[in-house]
Interface confidence: medium
Amino acid sequence: SAPGEDEECGRVRDFVAKLANNTHQHVFDDLRGSVSLSWVGDSTGVILVLTTFHVPLVIMTFGQSKLYRSEDYGKNFKDITDLINNTFIRTEFGMAIGPENSGKVVLTAEVSGGSRGGRIFRSSDFAKNFVQTDLPFHPLTQMMYSPQNSDYLLALSTENGLWVSKNFGGKWEEIHKAVCLAKWGSDNTIFFTTYANGSCKADLGALELWRTSDLGKSFKTIGVKIYSFGLGGRFLFASVMADKDTTRRIHVSTDQGDTWSMAQLPSVGQEQFYSILAANDDMVFMHVDEPGDTGFGTIFTSDDRGIVYSKSLDRHLYTTTGGETDFTNVTSLRGVYITSVLSEDNSIQTMITFDQGGRWTHLRKPENSECDATAKNKNECSLHIHASYSISQKLNVPMAPLSEPNAVGIVIAHGSVGDAISVMVPDVYISDDGGYSWTKMLEGPHYYTILDSGGIIVAIEHSSRPINVIKFSTDEGQCWQTYTFTRDPIYFTGLASEPGARSMNISIWGFTESFLTSQWVSYTIDFKDILERNCEEKDYTIWLAHSTDPEDYEDGCILGYKEQFLRLRKSSVCQNGRDYVVTKQPSICLCSLEDFLCDFGYYRPENDSKCVEQPELKGHDLEFCLYGREEHLTTNGYRKIPGDKCQGGVNPVREVKDLKKKCTSNFLSPEKQNSKSN
């Protein structure tokens, strides 16, 4: 039988009455256009909703927008358009919400063609009040907050000026002209690229990378011949043009650009690209595109310096620059990532790693599923996950995979079971152990969200017809109840719940359509009365993450340590609550060769954990560029995996002897860098 229809599925008592008392409808007095929704702060209950409607006239487009505010998680909304003087807000800039709980909001207004500059509306009290500010420039990008200080904003102008405000947008100063891209770094540092000969596009590959650490009082050129740059974790990356040809290489800095090292990655040509798939303070996943229009490349994982890279996954699906990749960080379990590969026969298959890219495998076939038509062997196949690529291909996939850090082990995704991703209508699958095992959770495509740190999962069927039913589960998707939230079905457009999955409120967004008008409508359902009591100690059970053989002493060891979690029992119907903190207990493991990656000049043969010297380098002194010097590297071939905490066990030792010769590579050594002050 389908999940949720088994006899043993316990029913939540009187749930219809409980939910009916906690269902709040709000009809927006708006013609249907577009709607965008932003949460302001964490656990504040404040939501801003911006509706926009365009009326195309013969010579121009007339726009109208309305702003609504809720302070009870979407149960009630108040029209606050008058606070922004009924101004039309530009949706392409969205609502710029300040970091953390700053309560800051910036809205960018549409202004008439002849005006000297743009206009913004600023709030620093969670959108209770707004201040109108006229800008001395026309913004090209959304205002960007400094992660360290929400009073510091930066923006690029349509004339490529870099503008900075130190008082939350009240006063603006142009600190540099001819700027292509600007990003906040740590400690209120700004990194940006500049062009010299006309435009960003014309100078691509000849840009300069600059840094200011004092909001534009002084500058330092930290790179030349720059194609692009990026920040990931504690790493600053720049792709730099080679001296002799049109290829470029990645260079990396861990000291804000003072010193650079050439990453041991393949160079790429004009039509290829690099992409930082994921980065943290320990390491980075880097995608390097294959030559030609193949649609795939190779994933490499870095060492702790971002310099030495190990090949992690071949034929990684990634369509063109800025295109689609299915690479997904499973945030509910450490070390787990899911992505797709393009196989030789051009079919797409899902791969998963549990050890931060060390090894990739297919997803285990769900026990309650049959292999589909793509499977050669009906008894042997895998689960394949639909993600960004499937969505871009307009398959019937309404949502990407979902996981939440505080809903430990839970992953929800659309998928098909076979030898490759199928174009057939997908079903929804759930894993409760971070991707090791999977179960079919719902038949057909659905929207889904996690509430109360995993205590409740909510789903709505993806349908072209109007809907009025929501499904929910209190046991991690094993059993489902259905609730009719309105008599009059609506055209569903989206589910909204507070980011972080701690809330017990869900908002269902859609529109009603009648002969004369269509209107936006939201239904907010509070599940607090379904989970009647607070969870107690007895409601939780110990769960060893990454466990495959509970007796084995090394069971659960990933990156040198194992973690035991307190997990809510599936049978417990209770509230984790907004203050729920994941209880985890790490313990150190013995080091094995799996805890080390191969150092520069070494590689791991297939199905072998030992690192062996690359044949072409055997017997040669290994020389590579590090911090702008040439180093002589004496190594036994191993380097500890970034973030690995193992102790004892095997301990391959490594030493680096410094020859202090200048590098011949073309990146900047500190001596070549220059500074200037405003």
């Epitope: 053989d549 084995d552 035991q564 066990g649 095997v650």
Partner: antibody, heavy 118, light 107 residues
Framework: EVQLVESGGGLVQPGGSLRLSCAAS????????MSWVRQTPDKRLEWVAI????????YYSDTVKGRFTISRDNSKNSLYLQMNSLRAEDTAVYYC???????????WGQGTLVTVSS | DIQMTQSPSSVSASVGDRVTITCHAS??????IGWLQQKPGKAFKGLIY???NLKDGVPSRFSGSGSGADFTLTISSLQPEDFATYFC?????????FGQGTKVEKR
Amino acid sequence: EVQLVESGGGLVQPGGSLRLSCAASGFTFSTYGMSWVRQTPDKRLEWVAIISSGGSYTYYSDTVKGRFTISRDNSKNSLYLQMNSLRAEDTAVYYCSRSSSHWYFDVWGQGTLVTVSS
Amino acid sequence: DIQMTQSPSSVSASVGDRVTITCHASQGISSNIGWLQQKPGKAFKGLIYHGTNLKDGVPSRFSGSGSGADFTLTISSLQPEDFATYFCVQYAQFPYTFGQGTKVEKR
């Protein structure tokens, strides 16, 4: 019944060697990490060494590193501790103990006494 | 190395008494602590693991509490067979270390 039985203890002179054995029964020996722990005459417990379930990985306390070697033979369900360059302060009752991924030191043997004296 | 400081070193008690033994770790060890019982001439016996979890077959009068650096073993109502020496052990990181032991003797 889960059981661990140590043997091989005795009197040895400083600088001498001894090999302790631990015979395991009643459980799947090859899936458990195994430790040696000693109890000194003043009844303090000191963890000595551990070996992973497959036998590939070991770890030692600083006091015995370089002198003691822990090993196992999964085909014989046996754990060993080769003790070289013995010192007076190594005098203790030596216990073997098993550890799973969830449980540390959950099963112990009766111990074997090692006395290092001239 | 992580030091485990156990107190008291001995306690005199009668049958039916509530006995509490504490262990302090020199740094945070999450809940990676176990409690062991030693009786003369008998093998050590594991009582509690992960700070609070009772090993199968161990009477419910034994309980563990604490997390981080401070931990407690409690015997709610002392029974004749509970007179023994109790040790805590941390297994958060190598080298594993033990408390000095607490001897529970008859008053």
